[in-house]
């Protein structure tokens, strides 16, 4: 494994509590826009300030939403995803797909640029 | 190093047209909402047009059937094509980038944005 990146991926359940401006973050993906090869799932591109995500700390930019208050988020138009989110209601529990760069052995940084590696 | 470069404004008889412009580098559109905003003097920033990461347009009332939003990801550039031009569109006019979409609001909400350009004037008089 010398000198070799390789990917640690977890997942986590993440309850989120609607705050005034929001869930506060944003994403790409979908059926009709993917952000990954050969992937249409929803990632989260951007965590605002502030804002609900940021505060509770566990969602991080990169990380790929599985579910939506159970709801599978596979094979969903962009804006269909945008519109499930923004219908979650006030408590909002998240499915998410962390993926973690390691690299001979321990666990490094998260990994820049596009989640495709 | 993100930017945003406006250009294209200028001054514009009541009734007249003009295309402004907003040209990105340091990343490319594809993913990113782009939106048009504009400030009048002693007014707040206000949206006016924006176009999301998925290519959807959309248009503030005062504006719909006037101005047409338009993206070439090719030249990583945004267009904002003005007619009809009323003395009250006079303002500076800014353009805003966005990484993917808000899962809070649509794109015409300030708020959302967290790259902006320098603004050019358009002045209908």
């Known amino acids: 494994m010398n000198g070799r990146v390789d990917y640690l991926v977890t997942e986590e359940e993440i309850n989120l509590t609607r705050g005034p401006s929001g869930l506060g973050f944003n994403i790409v993906g979908g059926t009709d826009q993917q952000y990954v090869s050969n992937d249409s799932g929803i990632y989260v591109s951007r965590i605002k300030e502030n804002g609900a995500a940021a505060l509770d700390g566990r969602l991080q930019e990169g990380d790929k939403i599985l579910s939506v208050n159970g709801q599978d988020l596979k094979n969903l138009l962009h804006q269909d995803a945008v519109d499930l989110f923004r219908n979650a209601g006030y408590a909002v529990s998240l499915r998410v797909q962390h993926r973690l760069q390691v690299q001979n052995g321990p666990i490094g940084h998260r990994g820049e640029g596009d989640p495709s590696g | 190093e993100v930017q945003l470069v406006e250009s294209g404004g200028g001054l514009v008889q009541p009734g007249g047209s003009v295309r402004v412009s907003c040209v990105s580098s340091g990343f490319i559109l594809d993913y990113y909402a782009i939106g048009w905003f504009r400030q009048a003097p002693g007014k707040e920033r206000e949206g006016v047009s924006c176009?999301?990461?998925?290519?959807?347009?959309y248009y503030v009332d005062s504006v719909k059937g006037r101005f047409t939003i338009s993206r070439d990801n090719a030249k990583n550039t945004v267009y904002l094509q003005m007619n009809s031009l009323k003395p009250e569109d006079t303002a500076v006019y800014y353009c805003a980038a966005d990484f993917g979409s808000s899962v809070d609001s649509t794109c015409l909400n300030n708020q959302q944005y967290n790259y902006w350009g320098q603004g050019t004037q358009v002045t209908v008089s």
């Open positions: 176009i999301d990461s998925v290519g959807r347009a």
